[in-house]
Amino acid sequence: HSDGIFTDSYSRYRKQMAVKKYLAAVLGKRYKQRVKNK
């Protein structure tokens, strides 16, 4: 038995996690670059 609501919910959750991870990586990179430039 499969129900789309669990896949919809989980896919949404994982997309949000991926975006958060990406933004953290980008912001972390920028911060390191700023520190390096100082």
Epitope: H1, S2, D3, G4, I5, F6, T7, S9, Y10, S11, Y13, R14, Q16, M17, K20, K21, A24
Partner: antibody, heavy 108, light 113 residues
Framework: AEGGLVKPGGSLELCCKA??????????MCWVRQAPGKGLEWIGC????????DYASWVNGQFTLSRDIDQSTGCLQLNSLTVADTAMYYC??????WGPGTLVTVSS | AQVLTQTPSSVSAAVGGTVTINCQSS????????LSWFQQKPGQPPKGLIA???TLASGVPSRFKGSGSGTQFTLTISGVQCDDAAAYYC?????????????FGGGTEVVVK
Amino acid sequence: AEGGLVKPGGSLELCCKASGFSLSSTYWMCWVRQAPGKGLEWIGCIYTGSGSTDYASWVNGQFTLSRDIDQSTGCLQLNSLTVADTAMYYCTKNFDLWGPGTLVTVSS
Amino acid sequence: AQVLTQTPSSVSAAVGGTVTINCQSSPSVYSNNYLSWFQQKPGQPPKGLIADASTLASGVPSRFKGSGSGTQFTLTISGVQCDDAAAYYCLGYYDCGSTDCHAFGGGTEVVVK
């Protein structure tokens, strides 16, 4: 997935084969275990697209997730097994579709 | 690591009665609503009942209701039937960056008299 009897310190690989949908369709395959008479315990998840993984902190490198897109399988490698790892191991697609589970018994 | 405390661990109800199962999360689940409920009968894998704290899966009777947000969640079974005798588990989704992605509650055994 093939379970069975393993001696303490031994290893075992459990594999879950996708049927009715393709592993190449990309989703998260998660693994959950349940010791006899106990509750459910999350082990980890693997994304079938990139192979990206997340593990429960207690796993501590003892278990490893992998996937084979060509064979439409997701696998869980169990290492350094102890009696405490005796459990029914379930694979699940997005916590939506669940496999029947496979019993792993660790005993000397 | 996060903790999902499920209470009670066991509950007995008469047919037609009401069962309330609580799930308390520490910290809050992600987005305050990423919590699912599962039903498990002996010898079977879990079956999804409710996603996103309150969305009922198709084919699940309307006597099952999920509610709550953040750290406090409830599964209510109104008009309990014999078929509802099972173990029930909550599952939280968390911020993977700072803690484990998931945790299950300890489970609640529902006995129907």
